[in-house]
Interface confidence: medium
């Protein structure tokens, strides 16, 4: 039961990291109160959102002014990768802590008080007590 929910949590974390990477690769849209989606910009002349990709062919279209450049790749990927790695480390830490705690709690029922202070690979019990 617990293992299943942890697996689900890990899957969500990986998915979140992947989405963060995708968003950062897509580049940054110029700020403003625009109703336009990422990679498009408002055309005052045409009164609608236009795809920024068309600015390569027609760079002097009015809406091209609102098309932002994507930041340089190393900086763009640094934070999602770092954040994902830290999150993964945190979840793995929680997972291993939980497994040790479960194992020690099970052993607690069957061991003598002398063994509780000293070992069998369960320092957590001694620390708690």
């Amino acid at each position: 039961m617990a293992r299943g929910s942890l697996r689900r949590l890990l899957r969500l974390l990986v998915l979140g990291l992947w989405l963060a990477l995708l968003r950062s690769v897509a580049g940054e849209q110029a700020p403003g109160t625009a109703p336009c989606s990422r990679g498009s910009s408002w055309s005052a002349d045409l009164d609608k959102c236009m795809d920024c990709a068309s600015c390569r062919a027609r760079p002097h279209s009015d809406f091209c002014l609102g098309c932002a450049a994507a930041p340089p790749a190393p900086f763009r990927l640094l934070w999602p990768i770092l954040g994902g790695a830290l999150s993964l480390t945190f979840v793995l830490g929680l997972l291993s802590g939980f497994l040790v705690w479960r194992r020690c709690r099970r052993r607690e029922k069957f061991t003598t008080p002398i063994e509780e202070t000293g070992g069998e690979g369960c320092p957590a019990v001694a620390l708690i007590q």
């Epitope: 403003g32 109160t33 109703p35 600015c55 009015d62 002014l65 098309c67 932002a68």
Partner: antibody, heavy 120, light 108 residues
């Protein structure tokens, strides 16, 4: 904090050239279009030129077209205005400004201004 | 974009500065208003017709009137520090960014 610091103004003879610089800090430079606006002594504001965040799209007022070139160095967070074939009527305080260009074309951050005097 | 050359009013009173668009509808593109004190760079007091940047007092307000095809900047409770030049600005097809001629506000 968000800041635009200008440099490069001065006295130049008619027909001469000058390059203005505008160093940006405190914001993601590549995400914003940038613009140059000038103000002749005792006159109003006049838009001169604008450039998209990528630098791929440039725009000019008719009065400077073919003489002025706007550019940007995104890794250096710097905006430039190369002014050639300068005339007496180009004498003005030149301001660089950050443009909120997606959905409305307004300037929300301005440089301190730099005086360009064209005189023989 | 046409603005009155100058306006004047006493402290504590309300003043309205107009900005009339000669071609095209005033409502088709957003209007911004800038304040410029002598010897200083302009600062935004109104953007997107009616929006006020943080730090700008609520004595400043912007509006659009389609019947007169003009935008207006209203300053209530006038203070001596409001004395400055005010410029409206909008988008214009072809010239991209266009400014009004400016209005000198004198607080008597």
């Amino acid at each position: 904090q968000v800041q635009l610091v200008q440099s490069g103004g001065g006295l130049v003879k008619p027909g001469g050239s000058l390059r203005l610089s505008c160093a940006a800090s405190g914001f993601t430079f590549t995400s914003y279009a940038m613009s140059w606006v000038r103000q002749a002594p005792g006159k109003g504001l006049e838009w001169v030129s604008a450039i998209s965040g990528s630098g791929g799209s440039t725009y000019y007022a008719d009065s400077v077209k073919g003489r002025f070139t706007i550019s940007r160095d995104n890794p250096k967070n710097t905006l430039y205005l190369q002014m050639n074939s300068l005339r007496a009527e180009d004498t003005a305080v030149y301001y660089c400004a950050r443009v909120r260009a997606n959905y409305y074309y307004g300037m929300d951050v301005w440089g301190q201004g730099t005086l360009v005097t064209v005189s023989s | 974009l046409t603005q009155p050359h100058s306006v004047s009013e006493s402290p504590g009173k309300t003043v309205t500065i107009s900005c009339t668009r000669s071609s095209g509808s005033i409502a088709s593109n957003y209007v911004q208003w800038y304040q410029q004190r002598p010897g200083s760079a302009p600062t935004t007091v109104i953007y997107e017709d009616t929006q006020r940047p943080s730090g700008v007092p609520d004595r400043f307000s912007g509006s659009i009137d389609t019947s007169s095809n003009s935008a207006s900047l209203r300053i209530s409770g006038l203070k001596p520090e409001d004395e400055a030049d005010y410029y409206c600005q909008s988008y214009a097809s072809g010239s991209l960014i266009v400014f009004g001629g400016g209005t000198k506000l004198t607080v008597l």
